[in-house]
């Protein structure tokens, strides 16, 4: 019983750490903001789910459109 309780608590802790399952856990969608005006060249890197570093979020969004891909933002900062 004690072992089962510890196991359940551990499982709950793991679930809370991992967050939601599905797309949310992979990353968030990049926003183009003002797509018609393009993106500035300000270097504020984000790491894509493809393992590539993008100069900023807007650039990732643009590349997704131009390349017809669906790369998400894995984390802020370089990969």
């Amino acid at each position: 019983m004690k072992v089962t309780g510890i196991f359940l608590l551990s499982a709950l802790a793991l679930l809370s750490l991992s967050g939601n399952t599905g797309a949310d856990s992979l990353g968030r969608e990049a926003k183009c903001y003002n797509e018609l005006n393009g993106c500035t060249k300000i270097y504020d890197p984000v790491c894509g789910t493809d393992g590539n570093t993008y100069p900023n979020e807007c650039v990732l969004c643009f590349e997704n459109r131009k390349r017809q891909t669906s790369i998400l933002i894995q984390k802020s900062g370089p990969c």
Partner: antibody, heavy 118, light 110 residues
């Protein structure tokens, strides 16, 4: 800010072409670079692009025999094209995208002539 | 495929006249269209981007318009220096593309 293609020259059919675009005054981690060619007396033909992320896209006709890579430390972008034929005879240009992302080819190199002949 | 069709292939204009070049995309490219001018032995020079925005240092005699699939480059008050070949280029997609450029229009100034 500038881009310049390496020397072209004379190649034989089936040879592999390697051209280098040397860039100065900007970072390849922030700017994408395209390759475009122009056969004598013909129009402009897009070959492909390497984006700021390092991902590359190619024209459908070039995909199977072209590779575009970059070296951000050396400030170079390289085009490799295999299985050359006489139809690949052209002036090859590299071009950098604009300061506003999404609008390519604002800065062009002078071009380099590649001749394929037996 | 985003194929670009440019018309006419060649046009003749008198000094001071007006030239109109059309570019049609096979599917909508929003406003992602560039216009270039190329003279023999030189690389292309970008005139207009985002369909209607004049590139830095380009004369206001050049005007771009259109969106979606239909675009126009108008050269007013044509000068001898405008004799060149003009190309449109879609900048919307790089995926599964044959060529981002139109076939070109040669402008001859009389």
């Amino acid at each position: 800010q500038s881009v310049k293609e390496s020397e072209g020259g004379l190649f034989k059919p089936t040879d592999t072409l390697t051209l280098t675009c040397t860039v100065s005054g900007f970072s390849l981690s922030i700017y994408g670079v395209s390759w475009v060619r122009q056969a004598p007396g013909n129009g402009l033909e897009w070959i492909g692009i390497i984006y700021a992320s390092g991902s590359a896209d190619y024209a459908s006709w070039a995909k199977s025999r072209s590779t575009i890579t970059r070296n951000t430390n050396l400030n170079t972008v390289t085009l490799k094209m295999t299985s050359l034929t006489a139809a690949d005879t052209a002036t090859y240009f590299c071009a950098r995208e604009d300061d506003t992302y999404g609008y390519t080819s604002s800065i062009w190199g002078p071009g380099t002539l590649v001749t394929v002949s037996s | 495929a985003y194929d670009m069709t440019q018309t006419p292939a060649s046009v003749s204009a008198a000094v001071g006249g007006t030239v109109t070049i059309k570019c049609q995309a096979s599917q909508s490219i929003s406003s992602y269209l560039n216009w270039y001018q190329q003279k023999p032995g030189q690389p292309p020079k970008r005139l207009i981007y985002r369909a209607s925005t004049l590139a830095s240092g380009v004369s206001s005699r050049f005007k771009g318009s259109g969106s979606g699939t239909q675009f126009t480059l108008t050269i007013s008050g044509v000068e001898c220096a405008d004799a060149a070949t003009y190309y449109c280029q879609q900048d919307y997609s790089s995926n599964n593309i044959d060529n981002t450029f139109g076939g070109g229009t040669e402008v001859v100034v009389k």
